[in-house]
């Protein structure tokens, strides 16, 4: 806490100036009038105060607002904001997306803060749902902010807010996550044709179930093995070999480098070791010649 | 439109002092802070020091510390920079520039020491 | 004394992207973000281009961009055109000293 001392003659502030950056913390805290900071907050970013003044400068924002900033201030606090605790944050009201992007703008370059996740945290409740300019806009800050969301968050996300997500927004993305997401993206995407699609579809795949799979093999989507190796295990597992070899196209030929890996492993488990020989790739590991199979879902669920 | 009028070029002996001038128009002139930067044929910005008129204080750059002397008039609106005991290597072009972050810069001086 | 490191110059063709670094210090670029750019032409005063890491005053193209990283900020110019060509300095304000430092400035060329 500063302590309270009468302002030195000549040095009250009449503006938020360039000056400032010359006076003790104990000069700011007597000859700035918390009222003046909060109408010219605009100007605090371009002067070059120490972190020691910014202290100062919170303190009497706090006490002018000991129920939370007004819209106004927090849209201009600028490097301020960096100040500011989760517990602050939550005082505040943030409905525009304006006052949004200029404080991550602030946080840009760095992780993710605790104050930066409260914030968007008040703001999307604020809203009510996730569309697709706060998206956009969190996406293009933190491209891994999709994936932070749990699967309940994940389901307030509108379909429309989907053609805001890049491939590389899902990169950390769980299989749970990818559930919720998938049939949102279906939907978004629904009125493209096939292969504008899959260009679309792809990168959430991993949330695809067994019939989707099926229906692309249809479609000489030619699938890579990276987006292969992240399906869902349970969703590849009753694809055919028929019906694998279509879906890859021409990328059939990297399962054998990853025989040893799921899903791929799995699969070939499931698979009989004839119609394994007939992709010509020296897959081993399925089930003989002669051998019945056992529906082992059904199996699972009895037992 | 803001603009900073810088006095004419000098030509001064080895040992001698030189003061350059820097007259602002079109902005408030107390509050902000301005700033004297050197350039030295073919080399780069080096900041000298500055000041805030309203204050009339000064702050200097350690390597001129003692050699330089910032002023301001509030009422011509005019700050000025003060280089005494002049040598060869002060030869330089001399700018006033307005703000920390230097909005605005004079069209420069050019100081030429030399016997 | 120069406190901030540049590289002596960088170079690119019509319409491409370049990117010039200055790295200082936790007490100057990284500890603040109050870094500038600055284009000087031959003969000319230096012209501000980006303040506050990343903010354009009014009048400059949204070609030049700036962002920092720790101890190293990045002046970016896009699209990159004949009259790009120039001397572009960092500086920032350095609170221990309460004053200005300069990079010792990168020469921009553009190819062609």
């Known amino acids: 806490e500063v302590e309270k001392t009468a302002c030195p003659s000549g040095k009250k502030a009449r503006e938020i100036d360039e000056s400032l950056i010359f006076y003790k913390k104990w000069e700011l805290e007597a000859c700035v009038d918390a009222a003046l900071l909060a109408t010219q907050m605009d100007r605090v970013n371009a002067i070059p105060f120490t972190y020691e003044q910014l202290d100062v400068l919170k303190h009497k924002l706090d006490e002018l607002y000991p129920q939370g900033y007004p819209e106004s201030v927090i849209q201009h606090l600028g490097y301020l904001f960096l100040k500011m605790s989760p517990e602050d944050i939550r005082k505040w009201n943030v409905t525009s997306l304006e006052t949004l992007k200029a404080l991550l703008e602030v946080n840009k370059g760095h992780e993710m803060s605790p104050q930066v996740a409260t914030l968007i945290d008040r703001f999307v409740k604020g809203r009510g749902q996730l569309d697709k300019d706060t998206l956009d806009t969190l996406t293009a800050f933190y491209p891994g902010y999709l994936c932070s969301l749990s699967p309940e968050e994940l389901s307030s996300v509108p379909p429309s807010s989907i053609w805001a997500v890049r491939p590389q927004d899902l990169d950390t993305c769980d299989p749970r996550q990818l559930d919720v997401l998938y049939p949102k993206a279906r939907l978004a995407f629904q009125n493209m044709n096939g292969s504008e699609y899959f260009v679309k579809i792809q990168s959430f795949l991993g949330g695809a179930p067994t019939e989707d799979l099926k229906a692309l093999s249809q479609q000489n989507v030619s699938m890579d093995l990276a987006t292969f190796m992240k399906l869902r295990t349970d969703a590849v597992l009753p694809l055919t070999v028929a019906e694998v070899q279509k879906l890859l196209g021409p990328h059939v030929e990297g399962l054998k480098a990853e025989e040893r890996h799921r899903p791929v492993r799995d699969w070939i488990l499931r698979q009989r070791q004839d119609d394994l020989d007939t992709l010509g790739l020296g897959l081993q590991g399925g089930i003989p010649n002669g051998y019945l199979v056992l529906d082992l879902s059904v199996q699972e669920a009895l037992s | 439109q803001v603009q900073l009028v810088q006095s004419g070029a000098e030509v001064k002996k080895p040992g001698s002092s030189v003061k350059v001038s820097c007259k602002a128009s079109g902005g408030t002139f107390s509050s902000y802070y301005f700033s004297w930067v050197r350039q030295a044929p073919g080399q780069g910005l080096e900041w000298m020091g500055g000041?805030?008129?309203?204050?009339?204080?000064?702050n200097y750059a350690q390597k001129f510390q003692g050699r330089v002397t910032i002023t301001a008039d509030e009422s011509t609106s005019t700050a000025y920079m003060e280089l005494s005991s002049l040598r060869s290597e002060d030869t330089a072009v001399y700018y006033c520039?307005?703000?920390?972050?230097?909005?605005?810069w004079g069209q420069g001086t050019l100081v030429t020491v030399s016997s | 004394d120069i406190a901030l490191t540049q590289p002596a110059s960088v170079s690119g063709s019509p319409g491409q992207s370049i990117t010039i670094s200055c790295t200082g210090t936790s007490s100057d670029v990284g500890g603040y973000n109050y870094v500038s750019w600055y284009q000087q032409h031959p003969g000319k005063a230096p012209k501000l281009m980006i303040y506050?890491?990343?903010k354009r005053p009014s009048g400059v193209s949204n070609r030049f961009s700036g962002s920092k990283s720790g101890n190293t900020a990045s002046l970016t110019i896009s699209g990159l055109q004949a009259e790009d060509e120039a001397d572009y300095y960092c500086g920032a304000w350095a609170h221990m000293s309460l004053g200005k430092v300069f990079g010792g400035g990168t020469k921009l060329t553009v190819l062609g």
């Open positions: 520039a307005r703000r920390t972050s230097m909005d605005y």
């Open positions: 000041i805030i008129p309203k204050f009339g204080s000064a």
């Open positions: 506050s890491v990343s």
